[in-house]
Interface confidence: low
């Protein structure tokens, strides 16, 4: 049946899917607060532009009876059930904000003729790449993959004079939703990362990881894993580590490394942490005050989704264009808008661009220091610390294969 969009005559509605299965275990109340704060800002901006219109959100809740795992495993059907609910109510907003699980987003995109934009805080997996009406406001796996390949190939920095072509990937199946899809992308045999590496092995058992740390016959000195320092400590403990081992710890949505009073524990000295450049350090709004850093990024993505819609609505209204058209549905990409925490850039495929930051532990100060930054928009690395106080010999990152000479 034809679902009418509540999206004209000066009244514009956002459909927000409030799914029990979510990329992050965030109370729905916090997401509601984020959406409402976003709505207030959008109303102010539209009013400021002389556009006298109404913008509201409708929160669509699933019954939670069937799909109650709380994580993303049973999200596929929940997303479709919510769409069915919208269909039965014969009511759809101008835009759909909601599915954060890769499974649900992929299935919803596949099973519906989407003539409206879909904005996601999540949907990290490669299967959600290159979707014409999908916008993702948290860094997807593709962006991580491109950084890693770029960094592996780099060999002209004072602290990295070897290009790398090998890696171990630690993936034990207990990862959070973001980590699951990041590592999944690295594991996939057809992915860009796998294509560019000569050797890559996935370590699935704790013991495999622990053995590699001192194995003289290891095939690579580099191990990629995903999670926070505590996750690494649980796995590695205080075990001895060969001096040319480099652990890359992917921990994108955690800005605790940048806090003034943080000291890096000793077990982090062989580790490079990949995280996102923190949002404006002054951000601590009413909606985010009680959130952990990861959850704040998740709630912030919801809020920015509302601001993105407001940005597009303003443009289309100022140009006198219709909102319920394929043109509007396909417009949420290749642009920069004013997000809550500063400008937000979306690439040609509607995926958020960001500045990734690679940190190391200074052996002098025991503090995390920025080694380099990487701009996902231009796929370019910018060295920051040309004389890092590394734990590695000669303050240079080792070769990825022990005993191999200069490349």
């Amino acid at each position: 049946s034809q679902v009418s969009q509540n999206c004209h005559n000066g009244s514009y509605e956002i459909s927000v899917l409030m799914m029990g299965n979510s990329a992050f275990a965030e109370p729905l109340k916090n997401l509601e607060d984020a959406v409402n704060e976003g709505l207030e800002i959008v109303r102010g901006r539209l009013q400021n532009a002389g556009l006298n219109v109404t913008v509201n959100a409708t929160f669509m809740y699933s019954d939670g009876l069937i799909h109650n795992s709380g994580d993303c495993r049973s999200s596929t059907c929940e997303g479709l059930d919510l769409l069915r609910k919208i269909s039965n109510a014969q009511r759809m907003g101008c835009v759909l904000i909601g599915p954060s699980c890769t499974y649900s987003t992929f299935q919803m995109y596949l099973d519906t003729e989407l003539s409206y934009p879909m904005i996601s805080a999540g949907s990290f997996g490669l299967s959600c790449d290159y979707k014409e009406t999908l916008t993702r406001l948290m860094s997807p796996a593709r962006k991580l993959m491109y950084f890693l390949v770029n960094f592996w190939k780099t060999n002209d920095l004072p602290f990295k004079t070897y290009s790398w072509s090998t890696s171990y990937v630690y993936k034990n199946g207990t990862e959070t939703e973001d980590c699951f899809w990041y590592l999944n992308a690295l594991e996939a045999s057809v992915s860009y990362f796998s294509h560019e590496l000569g050797f890559k092995v996935v370590l699935r058992q704790d013991k495999e990881f622990q053995d590699i740390l001192m194995d003289h016959n290891r095939k690579s000195n580099v191990i990629i894993m995903c999670g926070g320092p505590e996750f690494l400590y649980k796995l590695k403990g205080d075990r001895a580590v060969a001096e040319d081992i480099v652990i890359i710890l992917v921990d994108l949505f955690n800005d605790q490394y940048f806090e003034d009073n943080v000291t890096a524990p000793d077990y982090m000295k062989n580790v490079l942490v990949l995280t996102l450049s923190p949002g404006n350090s002054l951000l601590n709004s009413s909606f985010s005050r009680n959130l952990s850093p990861t959850k704040r990024d998740f709630a912030l993505a919801y809020l920015n989704g509302i601001l993105l819609f407001g940005h597009m609505l303003k443009i289309f209204l100022e140009n006198g264009e219709n909102i319920t058209t394929p043109k509007f549905a396909h417009a949420f990409r290749n642009l920069t808008f004013e997000g809550y925490d500063g400008p937000v850039t979306l690439d040609d495929w509607g995926d958020v661009d960001s500045t990734m930051v690679l940190l190391y532990t200074s052996v002098d100060t025991k503090k995390y220091k920025v080694l380099l930054t990487y701009d996902t928009h231009v796929n370019k690395t910018y060295p920051v610390d040309m004389s890092p106080t590394f734990t590695w010999k000669n303050s240079k990152l080792p070769n990825d294969i022990t005993g191999r000479g200069p490349q």
Partner: nanobody, 115 residues
Framework: QVQLVESGGGLVQPGGSLRLSCATS????????MGWYRGAPGKQRELVAR???????NYADSVKGRFTISRDNVKNTMYLQMNSLKPEDTAVYYC?????????WGQGTQVTVSS
Amino acid sequence: QVQLVESGGGLVQPGGSLRLSCATSGIIFHIYTMGWYRGAPGKQRELVARITSGGDTNYADSVKGRFTISRDNVKNTMYLQMNSLKPEDTAVYYCNRFPGATFSWGQGTQVTVSS
């Protein structure tokens, strides 16, 4: 119509104090994070201090311990108490939303610190 009206500036000797006010209208004031900015007209403005809708505050390093930002959500007004003023605090002071400064700028209020 959104309006931001800054007041309270003036000429003061080094070490002196001023209290700036930012009266707003046409916005749902209590929901916004607001900031005090300063700069010469037409030049890049720098953030001096900001206060969230919930009352959390942050300050630029150059004013920490000397300036205090506050707000009255009933009066839709924000304040900046400036103590121990220094010559380098001389500027036009503006209020706006943070981040993004998405409201039209007001006229600002001139603060001059000189002996």
